[in-house]
Structure formats: structure tokens, C-alpha cells
């Protein structure tokens, strides 16, 4: 059943999530720079084809309009969704040297947003099924591939970061 | 209430290995990340790696990324570090923390264990 | 790597009197989104470290209120308002903006 903005979400929890939702986006967009600078890859919407050959898939967040907002459905799909780009930044992982401590940061920013979004579905009793493994995740068969990869994950992560801010901005409201 | 116990004690020589275990109790094991930090007697806190458990993922201090091996076992909700070639200065207490974001981070830590290198 | 260095080393105080820790980070922990990822933990004496504040200013659940964190980007103090013999012990600065996480070399309390 749809639940508006003034459903049982404590601010402390909205502002916390605002918050990492921020950094996380700092860090992608820190990462799309490097590989910008030092690869030339600036532009994910060239490499749309290859995101579908390599496989790269998206995070829905089809429970989180504004208007007809599922809350148990939305935080579940942020969940998951948090929880996808776990494994895709992990498929990331040798990408260069360089670009390691912008990636490992990125990897546990992320995963401390799944723990905090998990913490209160947990606390509102409506936590998910714990996920057993990840699904199959993108296979690069060489260095270009992987950092091609790094652009279309990193797109696809601050797009969906966009919209988890705004449904969230939406349910901090008064 | 969240409780991390680690292993005892361990007497080691160089050129071994050690592998220290953390179990928790009190929360939701696979969704929180586990830390490892170290302190050599006298020392500061040094920072050697995390485990996500949820996917298995482990990402190490630089410093230590040929030696530690960070891991974790849902089922028994157990942490596990393991630190290979050892030296006389990994002498050291060598604790695991849960992680977490603002008022979460390492707002829970193990009793330690005192790991001796000595031949 | 984040370098992080605290003053003094090591501080003697007489009970019921101030105390102030400084700690300096060689980078800007302050982030983009308003948030400075700067941390105190005390370990007293035979004990793990426990959190005292997080995010430079924010005191930690069940701290006393004599504790304070403030600072800037790269220069933070935490500052006991009057200390009392329980407060003695190893005090840390560490950040959590990139990792490695990093510590400062800590400072030791000590009553007069």
C-alpha cells in the first residue's frame, strides 16, 4: 500500500541516508574523473553498446515515486539495489593502481549505506530476506574492458544515487 | 546487546602464520562490515583491513595486503584474520570492530588478542 | 595516505580541571556534503578503544557531556570541560574519509 512522506521513517534515518548518499556520490563522481583524466574514458553514453554486451545491469527503484511510494518496497529496492553495486564495483576490482583507493572507498561507502538502509527496515520490521549470493555479475576479458566497465558502473550508480536522494529529500519533508 | 569475543592468546615463531577469530553475537552478522585493527605494545591503533560479509569481500591496508587474509563465515557468525610471515613486529593486541556509518563506526570492539612473535 | 598527528603526547591534569587534545590531518576531512569524517576514541587502561565522538563534534551515545569534539577542516581539538579520574587512558584522533582508516599517534592522560 502506498505511504506518503509522512510515514514512520525517523529524520535521524533521513538525514543519515542523505548524507551518505552525498559522500557516495562524491566518490563516484571522483572515480569518473580519474577515469576520465587518465583514460580519456569520459563519456558512459559512448559505451552504452558495450554496457550491454558486458552485461551491466541496472537497480530499479519502480516502488519509489513520490507519488504512490511503497515504503517497504522502496527501502527494499534501495537495498538491493545498494547490494547489485556491491558485486559490480567488487567485478571492478585490478582495475589500476591509480584508481584502487578511489574504488576501495567507494566499495565500503556503499556497503555501510546497505547497513544503514538494512538497520532500519530491521527496526520497522520489515527487513528482507538476508540475499544469499550475489547474481551473476559482468566478466571483463581485458584491462579496457574493466575500466569501460568502471564509467558504466559508476554512470549507472550515480544515476541511481540521483533518485535515491530525491525519494529521500521527498520523505524528509515535514 | 552486540558482543565481539575473539580467540585467545597465541605464541608464535617467525615466519608463521595466526589466524584470529571474532565471533558476534547480538545483531544481524552478514549485514554490518568487520574490521581488523592492531596495536603493538606501547603503539597506536593501526587500521589492517575489512570484510563485507554479505558478499565476501575483503579490502586490506596496503601495508598488509600481501600477509592478511580477512574472511568470514555467516553461518557461525564468525570474523577470521589471518596474518601470514610473521615477524617480531606483528607482535601486537589485534582487535576486530564492527563498522558501520557515523555514530555506527566502531562503536563495538573485541577484547583483543595478544598475538607473540618470538623464536 | 591521511596522516593524522595529535599534541601533546602525553598530558598531565589535575582532577576537576580542563584538558585539551589537539589532532591535524594532512588532508581536508571535511566532504563535500557538510560532513568532517574526524573521530575520537578512548582506550582506557586494559580496555579495547571505545568511541567517544563522531564526525568531528557529535557526542557518541552514553559520553558524558564534559566531552567536546570542534575543529575545522584539518585542525581539531577535543576538549574535557573538567576532567574526572575515570577519563584516563589513550585518547585517538582517526578519520573515515578515504580509506586506509588512519589514527593519530595518541595521547595519554594522566591525573597529577
Known amino acids: 500500500t502506498p505511504l506518503g512522506p509522512a510515514s514512520s521513517l525517523p529524520q535521524s534515518f533521513l538525514l543519515k541516508c542523505l548524507e551518505q548518499v552525498r559522500k557516495i556520490q562524491g566518490d563516484g563522481a571522483a572515480l569518473q574523473e580519474k577515469l576520465c583524466a587518465t583514460y580519456k574514458l569520459c563519456h558512459p553514453e559512448e559505451l552504452v553498446l558495450l554496457g550491454h554486451s558486458l552485461g551491466i545491469p541496472w537497480a530499479p527503484l519502480s516502488s519509489c515515486p513520490s507519488q504512490a511510494l511503497q515504503l517497504a518496497g522502496c527501502l527494499s529496492q534501495l537495498h538491493s539495489g545498494l547490494f547489485l553495486y556491491q558485486g559490480l564495483l567488487q567485478a571492478l576490482e585490478g582495475i589500476s593502481p591509480e584508481l584502487g583507493p578511489t574504488l576501495d572507498t567507494l566499495q565500503l561507502d556503499v556497503a555501510d549505506f546497505a547497513t544503514t538502509i538494512w538497520q532500519q527496515m530491521e527496526e520497522l520490521g520489515m527487513a528482507p530476506a538476508l540475499q544469499p549470493t550475489q547474481g551473476a555479475m559482468p566478466a571483463f576479458a581485458s584491462a579496457f574492458q574493466r575500466r569501460a566497465g568502471g564509467v558504466l558502473v559508476a554512470s549507472h550508480l550515480q544515476s541511481f544515487l540521483e533518485v535515491s536522494y530525491r525519494v529521500l529529500r521527498h520523505l524528509a519533508q515535514p | 546487546q552486540v558482543q565481539l569475543v575473539q580467540s585467545g592468546a597465541e605464541v608464535k615463531k617467525p615466519g608463521a602464520s595466526v589466524k584470529v577469530s571474532c565471533k558476534a553475537s547480538g545483531y544481524t552478522f552478514p549485514i554490518y562490515t568487520m574490521h581488523w585493527v592492531r596495536q603493538a605494545p606501547g603503539q597506536g591503533l593501526e587500521w589492517m583491513g575489512y570484510?563485507?560479509?554479505?558478499?565476501?569481500?575483503?579490502n586490506y591496508n596496503q601495508k598488509f595486503r600481501d600477509r592478511v587474509t580477512i574472511t568470514a563465515d555467516t553461518s557461525t557468525s564468525t570474523a577470521y584474520m589471518e596474518l601470514s610471515s610473521l615477524r617480531s613486529e606483528d607482535t601486537a593486541v589485534y582487535y576486530c570492530a564492527r563498522g558501520g556509518y557515523g555514530d555506527s563506526l566502531f562503536a563495538y570492539w573485541g577484547q583483543g588478542t595478544l598475538v607473540t612473535v618470538s623464536s | 595516505d591521511i596522516v593524522m598527528t595529535q599534541s601533546p603526547l602525553s598530558l598531565p591534569v589535575t582532577p576537576g580541571e580542563p584538558a585539551s587534545i589537539s589532532c591535524r590531518s594532512s588532508k581536508s576531512l571535511l566532504h563535500s556534503n557538510g560532513i568532517t569524517y574526524l573521530y575520537w576514541y578512548l582506550q582506557k587502561p586494559g580496555q579495547s578503544p571505545q568511541l567517544l565522538i563522531y564526525q568531528m563534534s557529535n557526542l557518541a551515545s552514553g559520553v558524558p557531556d564534559r566531552f567536546s569534539g570542534s575543529g575545522s577542516g584539518t585542525d581539531f581539538t577535543l576538549k574535557i570541560s573538567r576532567v574526572e579520574a575515570e577519563d584516563v587512558g589513550v585518547y585517538y584522533c582517526a578519520q573515515n574519509l578515504e580509506l586506509p582508516y588512519t589514527f593519530g599517534q595518541g595521547t595519554k592522560l594522566e591525573i597529577k
Open positions: 570484510i563485507n560479509p554479505s558478499i565476501g569481500y575483503a
